[in-house]
């Protein structure tokens, strides 16, 4: 006869491991007992359990409550056992020794591999600011057995670097994603992808990028100077900028206080019907936690009568 087993049995942490050992004997042969032992190199054999044809399953105190026979129906030539709730410390070499009548003893070894799925964690790097050089955007760490694979999934251009730390029964892998921050990266997802044979599917953790920046400020509303004349209603100046975090706006007048009746509404400066006292230099001050910008414009409110008089003078001068 001969023993049938597996070279390697692989289970995920917490699952039950079936340790197979089947005696394929000639007719009339019977199995008297099957002894299971752990036989890691450098250590003596440690009895796990003994399956006796007459007295049933005997379990070592070290494995009390964790070793069982597979559920019925059972073949008397089957010496397989179930190791319940596999833990990392169960990983190793096991031997099945079968005593048969009348053929004698047979033995076989198998390796139990316990996969420890990783629990990845993603840590964002320091605050990203436009103008920085190559900066850490995020790091992702996963520990498992065997070592997990850690990669990145993103549309953002960057560089990755990985390092691994081996522990007694597992390995921790850390991957870092570096980039040169730019405003176009704002709101872009950066996803850490962890692969491992103990996972049914890859684990993914997504971090949304936030890059602090402040665009140059400009003022709109003076495109047609001829519209800025005495009596005009609804005249306004609008300050244009963008930033992360969103900026706040402040209006001042360089050559004095803001005239009465001028309304400040965030990025917009609204004027009452224009008078010559609205002429002056206006400054839009844009700021966020990252930076501040200024833009100034000169408003020159025209007096149509004065203008036409000038034109007459010019004409008469010619």
């Amino acid at each position: 006869g001969e023993l049938e087993t597996s070279d390697v049995v692989t289970v995920v942490l917490g699952q039950d491991a079936k340790l197979p050992c089947f005696y394929r004997g000639d007719s009339g042969e019977q199995v008297g007992q099957v002894a299971w032992a752990r036989v890691d190199a450098g250590e003596g054999a440690q009895e796990l359990a003994l399956l006796h044809s007459k007295y049933g399953l005997h379990v070592s105190p070290a494995y009390e409550g964790r070793v069982e026979q597979p559920p019925p129906p059972r073949n008397p030539l089957d010496g397989s056992v179930l190791l319940r709730n596999a833990v990392q410390a169960d990983e190793g070499e096991y031997e099945c020794r079968v005593s048969t009548f009348p053929a004698g003893s047979f033995q076989a070894r198998l390796r139990l591999r316990v996969l420890v799925p990783p629990l990845p964690s993603l840590n964002p790097g320091p605050a990203l600011e436009e103008g920085q050089g190559l900066t850490l955007a995020a790091s992702c760490t996963a520990e498992g057995s065997p070592a997990p694979s850690v990669t990145w999934d993103t549309e953002v251009k960057g560089t990755t670097s990985s390092r691994s730390f081996k522990h007694s029964r597992s390995a921790a892998v850390t991957s870092e994603f570096h980039l040169v921050p730019s405003r176009s990266m704002n709101g872009q997802p950066l996803t850490c992808v962890v692969s491992h044979p103990g996972l049914l599917q890859d684990q993914r953790i997504t971090h949304i990028l936030h890059v602090s920046f402040l665009a140059e400020a400009s003022v709109r509303g003076l495109e047609d100077q001829n519209l800025w004349h005495i009596g005009r209603e609804g005249a306004m100046l609008k300050c244009l900028s963008e930033g992360q975090p969103p900026p706040s706006y402040n209006w001042t007048r360089l050559d004095g206080p803001l005239p009465s009746g001028v309304r400040v509404d965030g990025d917009t400066l609204g004027f009452p019907p224009l008078t010559t006292e609205h002429s002056g230099i206006y400054v839009c001050h844009v700021s966020n936690e990252f930076s501040s910008r200024d833009s100034q414009v000169t408003v020159d409110v025209l007096d149509p009568q004065e203008d036409s008089g000038k034109q007459v003078d010019l004409v008469s001068a010619s």
Epitope: Q30, G32, Q33, A35, A37, Q46, E47, L48, A49, L50, H52, S53, K54, Y55, H58, V59, S60, P61, S99, F101, P102
Partner: nanobody
Framework: EVQLVESGGGLVQPGGSLRLSCAAS????????MGWHRQAPGKGLEWVAT???????NYADSVKGRFTISRDNSKNTLYLQMNSLRAEDTAAYYC?????????????WGQGTLVTVSS
């Protein structure tokens, strides 16, 4: 041949404890199994517990959690620690050595030791 001699039996009150011993001599194999059986007055033989050379154990449901079987291989001695004894544990306790033999197993029996649980 294997010879077995039990000791440690006696009278004990319900809830009390006793420790039985069994000294084995003779041609004991490396894959033997040792254990205890008992026979109450007027009843049939009942298996109590068995232990492998490596210390793996198996117990009858009726004694699980109360009785502990152990062995000292260097002295070829078997023990049965009996706690929380009940009247229904009253019986003759026999030590058994189970040896491989030809086409199966051969049981070697001791003479027995009497345990009486009574107030």
């Amino acid at each position: 041949e294997v010879q077995l001699v039990e000791s440690g039996g006696g009278l004990v009150q319900p809830g009390g404890s006793l420790r039985l011993s069994c000294a084995a001599s003779g041609s004991i194999s490396s894959i033997n199994l040792m254990g205890w059986h008992r026979q109450a007055p007027g009843k049939g033989l009942e298996w109590v517990a068995t232990i492998t050379r490596g210390g793996s154990t198996n117990y009858a449901d009726s004694v699980k959690g109360r009785f502990t079987i152990s062995r000292d291989n260097s002295k070829n001695t078997l023990y049965l620690q009996m706690n929380s004894l009940r009247a229904e544990d009253t019986a003759a306790y026999y030590c058994v050595d189970v040896e491989p033999s030809g086409m199966g197993w051969r049981d070697y029996w001791g003479q027995g030791t009497l345990v009486t649980v009574s107030s």
